[in-house]
């Protein structure tokens, strides 16, 4: 049961995370005009990955897309790329994880296949989350650099008679959405990888043979306790005798090759 819960929760957390990454990528408020220590302007500037906007105090908002590829800063292009890669990997991960979900039966899919798919989707979520976090962090770093540069200009460029309002930009809402979403996707991916361990069946390809000895009724499994290396199929020295029915999760809770990823 714990495995199903972990897998399901991992899927849901990743789903929320990827939705957040998509939302952050589409949002216009990656950087917003810094209003602290600034003259009170009747316009508010903010910028996204795809367009820049100006909201006038009258309520009118006007946005202009960046209709150039070559004219954009390399860093902005890199952030765009990271976010898109994160979305694509996340979307594929979601697709794979849907089929890997334990609660969904698709034909006669083996548990080992589901385990592999769970692991694959988990890794995809982890990379997706890292891409988003990296993209947002690169943009944030770019903002901090530009902020201090424009602050320096603010105090050095006052020599002339005419003053210019220097627009400085600070962190926008999209950055926080991106960081949180990336973190959620990462956590979801880790949960999927953890769930994968519990999903994997034993490596033995043959059924257990029962020997009925007089006096005691025990099931003997050849290779049940492997010798000393500790990397066998039953490293936890599980008691073979159950004395009753097992839940679906318990049936598949033996360690496997996926334990030591």
């Amino acid at each position: 049961m714990a495995v199903t819960a972990c897998q399901g929760l991992g899927f849901v957390v990743s789903l929320i995370g990827i939705a957040g990454i998509i939302a952050a990528t589409c949002m216009d408020q990656w950087s917003t005009q810094d209003l602290y220590n600034n003259p009170v302007t009747a316009v508010f500037n903010y910028q996204g990955l795809w367009r820049s906007c100006v909201r006038e105090s009258s309520g009118f908002t006007e946005c202009r897309g960046y209709f150039t590829l070559l004219g954009l800063p390399a860093m902005l292009q890199a952030v765009r790329a990271l976010m898109i890669v994160g979305i694509v990997l996340g979307a594929i991960g979601l697709l794979v994880s849907i089929f890997a979900l334990k609660c969904i039966r698709i034909g006669s899919m083996e548990d080992s296949a589901k385990a592999n798919m769970t692991l694959t989707s988990g890794i995809m979520f982890i990379v997706s989350g890292l891409c988003a976090i990296a993209g947002v962090s690169v943009f944030a770093n770019m903002l901090v650099t530009n902020f201090w540069m424009s602050t320096a200009n603010m105090y050095t460029g006052m020599g002339g008679m005419v003053q210019t309002v220097q627009t400085r930009y600070t962190f926008g809402a999209a950055l926080f959405v991106g960081w949180v979403a990336g973190g959620l996707t990462l956590i979801g991916g880790v949960m999927m990888c953890i769930a994968c361990r519990g999903l994997a069946p034993e490596e033995t390809n043959y059924k257990a043979v029962s020997y009925h000895a007089s006096g005691h009724s025990v099931a003997y499994k050849p290779g049940g306790f492997k010798a000393s290396t500790g990397f066998g199929s039953n490293t936890k020295n599980k008691k073979i005798y159950d004395g009753g029915a097992r839940t679906e999760d318990e049936v598949q809770s033996y360690p496997s090759k996926h334990d030591y990823v």
């Epitope: 302007t41 100006v54 009258s58 309520g59 005419v162 309002v165």
Partner: antibody
Framework: QVQLKESGPGLVAPSQSLSITCTVS????????VSWVRQPPGKGLEWLGV???????NYQSALRSRLSIRKDTSKSQVFLKLNSVHTDGTATYYC???????????WGQGISVIVSS | DIVMTQSPSSLTVTAGEKVTMSCKSS????????????LTWYQQRPGQPPKLLIY???SRESGVPVRFTGSGSGTDFTLTISSVQAEDLAVYYC?????????FGGGTKLEMN
């Protein structure tokens, strides 16, 4: 169509409060701001303040301590209150709708206010 | 506060003549976000409320005749009337619409010969 109309007393005694109401039609005060401007006889225009669609206000520096602008969205009314007026408060007071570019695109006819004892 | 200076204070013209009037601001009215200048021109005929002519320095308000043109950027702005008509006799005001508190220029009075 867009209309604005100022109303209030035409005569105010010095050191009293001047209150003017601007009743609007043809647009919503939720979406648009309203500015107040005054013009002393034979002189130029003087911007007093603005109340934006979101309810935030900005005032002229010299009058900030004595001026307040508020609105009643449901009644489509904007109120200007200027405390302890002096004789230099004698002017025609206009309210105007704020449009694109923060410009005042529609104006009321104005109300003439005389500050005198 | 931003100081708006208009020149000349009055202007005497003849019908059909081209007229230009100037407006200077003590601070730049250019917004870097959209590269627009937040300067507005108003026309006030005698006994009437002001009327919006030009917003964002060069955008003509709907219904305003094409003979009115606004230009300039940063701190220096110009209103041009390509061919003055009798109905253009009025006082013209420029206004800072960028930094609070908004401020008007002293006005340019257009008179006929």
């Amino acid at each position: 169509q867009v209309q604005l109309k100022e109303s209030g007393p035409g005569l105010v005694a010095p050191s009293q409060s001047l209150s003017i109401t601007c009743t609007v039609s043809g647009f919503s005060l939720i979406n648009y701001g309203v500015s107040w401007v005054r013009q002393p006889p034979g002189k130029g225009l003087e911007w007093l303040g603005v109340i934006r669609g979101d309810g935030n206000t900005n005032y002229q520096s010299a009058l900030r301590s004595r001026l307040s602008i508020r609105k009643d969205t449901s009644k489509s009314q904007v109120f200007l209150k200027l405390n302890s007026v002096h004789t230099d408060g004698t002017a025609t007071y206009y309210c105007a709708k704020v449009g694109r570019g923060n410009a005042m695109d529609h104006w009321g006819q104005g109300i003439s206010v005389i500050v005198s004892s | 506060d931003i100081v708006m200076t208009q020149s000349p204070s009055s202007l005497t013209v003849t019908a059909g003549e081209k007229v230009t009037m100037s407006c200077k601001s003590s601070q730049s009215l250019l917004n870097s976000g959209n590269q627009k200048n937040y300067l507005t021109w108003y026309q006030q005929r005698p006994g009437q409320p002001p009327k919006l002519l030009i917003y964002r320095a060069s955008s003509r308000e709907s219904g305003v005749p094409v003979r009115f043109t606004g230009s300039g950027s940063g701190t220096d702005f110009t209103l041009t009337i390509s061919s003055v008509q009798a109905e253009d006799l009025a006082v013209y005001y420029c206004q800072n619409d960028y930094i609070y508190p908004y401020t008007f220029g002293g006005g340019t009075k257009l008179e006929m010969n």
